[in-house]
């Protein structure tokens, strides 16, 4: 019985009631592997989803998210609202990153600025809500005898930036 069904190719299902005949999947359904007993209903890309790849009798539809949203989960199972750079999505919607944190993408959470002093470096460019700080040479490298293409950064607490 199993051997007969294994002859049924993708795009068909094995109909046990019909002497293991391979019936094409009905409209709006598919089987992506051979030997299937049933065809699966095609995924509908509706609402916040849009179709990236149409369904066929041998493969399911693939969805993307409409503009203003991005995919989450395996095979884009969910769409999450985009925020602006410098923001993160909370239960109450998009909120600006707190001081000392940044987000350079339309998705994800705000992350703390890099602490340059942990690497023995100084702040070359201050951080913002949208950008991390840029660390520069360590203060020792900026002694009067050392040649430097850039002037020393103002002496202030690492990561500090007036908002």
């Amino acid at each position: 019985l199993q051997d007969l069904c294994s002859n049924c190719p993708a795009g068909t299902f094995c109909d046990n009631n019909r002497s293991q005949i391979c019936s094409p999947c009905p409209p709006n359904s598919f089987s992506s592997a051979g030997g299937q007993r049933t065809c699966d209903i095609c995924r509908q890309c509706k609402g916040v989803f849009k179709t990236r790849k149409e369904c066929s009798s041998t493969s399911n539809a693939e969805c993307d998210c409409i503009s203003g949203y991005h995919c989450l989960g395996a095979e884009c199972s969910m769409c999450e609202q985009d925020c602006k750079q410098g923001q993160e999505l909370t239960k109450k919607g998009c909120k600006d990153c707190c001081f000392g944190t940044f987000n350079d993408q339309k998705r994800g959470i705000c992350r703390p600025w890099t602490n340059c002093s942990l690497d023995g470096k100084s702040v070359l460019v201050n951080g913002t809500k949208e950008r991390d700080v840029v660390c520069g040479p360590s203060p020792a490298d900026l002694s009067p005898g050392a040649s430097s293409a850039t002037p020393p950064a103002p002496a202030r607490e690492p990561g500090h930036s007036p908002q």
Partner: antibody, heavy 114, light 106 residues
Framework: DVQLVESGGDLVQPGGSRKLSCAAS????????MHWVRQAPERGLEWVAY????????YYADTVKGRFIISRDNPKNTLFLQMTSLRSEDTAMYYC???????WGQGTSVTVSS | QIVLTQSPAIMSASPGEKVTITCSAS?????IHWFQQKPGTSPKLWIY???NLASGVPARFSGRGSGTSYSLTISRMEAEDAATYYC?????????FGGGTKLEIK
């Protein structure tokens, strides 16, 4: 836009042969099985043959078995129906349709007459 | 092979009238499809897998049934519904069509 365009129909003598083609566009042809269906003048629809997406499974109506051969060329997005030993009762409009039967061509007319 | 018998073969209905076309199978089938065909055109898939309306089909159409008995219903007939309707069983080879029902507008 999905399109199926049949060609090759003509007037053929009884006992003669004819090869019909169906050019597909607007969808992934190699992902779909395909059918041929025909309709005699002022008559109903008759299913003729089916071929799976990779040509591994083929079925025919009893009325054409042994005389017609369905085949496909996936790289060229084309379906074929080779008809031999044609009879007057094969006179019909021949349609190709994808396996979901949701899209059909406009048909090509085959007339078998002396 | 499975024989599909459609009834009536021909009928006429007034605008607004409810119309039911039946399709009876000689042995049990898993589902049927319905097609609409107008003169000089290719058949159009109208209802698939017994009860699902194809894209663009008005909501006044519905399909139901199981086993050997299936039907297509138009809740309120409109002039544009005048056509020939065919049922098709795709459960068993050879696939078979019903003989068609010609629906005319009064």
């Amino acid at each position: 836009d999905v399109q199926l365009v049949e060609s090759g129909g003509d007037l053929v003598q009884p006992g003669g042969s004819r090869k019909l083609s169906c050019a597909a566009s607007g969808f992934t042809f190699s992902s779909f099985g395909m059918h041929w269906v025909r309709q005699a003048p002022e008559r109903g629809l008759e299913w003729v043959a089916y071929i799976s997406s990779g040509s591994s499974t083929i079925y025919y109506a009893d009325t054409v078995k042994g005389r017609f051969i369905i085949s496909r060329d996936n790289p060229k997005n084309t379906l074929f129906l080779q008809m031999t030993s044609l009879r007057s009762e094969d006179t019909a409009m021949y349609y190709c349709a994808r396996d979901w039967v949701d899209y059909w061509g406009q048909g090509t007319s085959v007339t078998v007459s002396s | 092979q499975i024989v599909l018998t459609q009834s009536p073969a021909i009928m006429s209905a007034s605008p607004g009238e409810k119309v039911t076309i039946t399709c009876s199978a000689s042995s049990s089938v898993n589902y049927i499809h319905w097609f609409q065909q107008k003169p000089g055109t290719s058949p159009k898939l109208w209802i698939y897998s017994t009860s699902n309306l194809a894209s663009g089909v008005p909501a006044r159409f519905s399909g139901r049934g199981s086993g050997t008995s299936y039907s297509l219903t138009i809740s309120r007939m409109e002039a544009e519904d005048a056509a020939t309707y065919y049922c098709l069983q795709g459960s068993s080879y050879p696939w078979t069509f019903g003989g068609g029902t010609k629906l005319e507008i009064k």
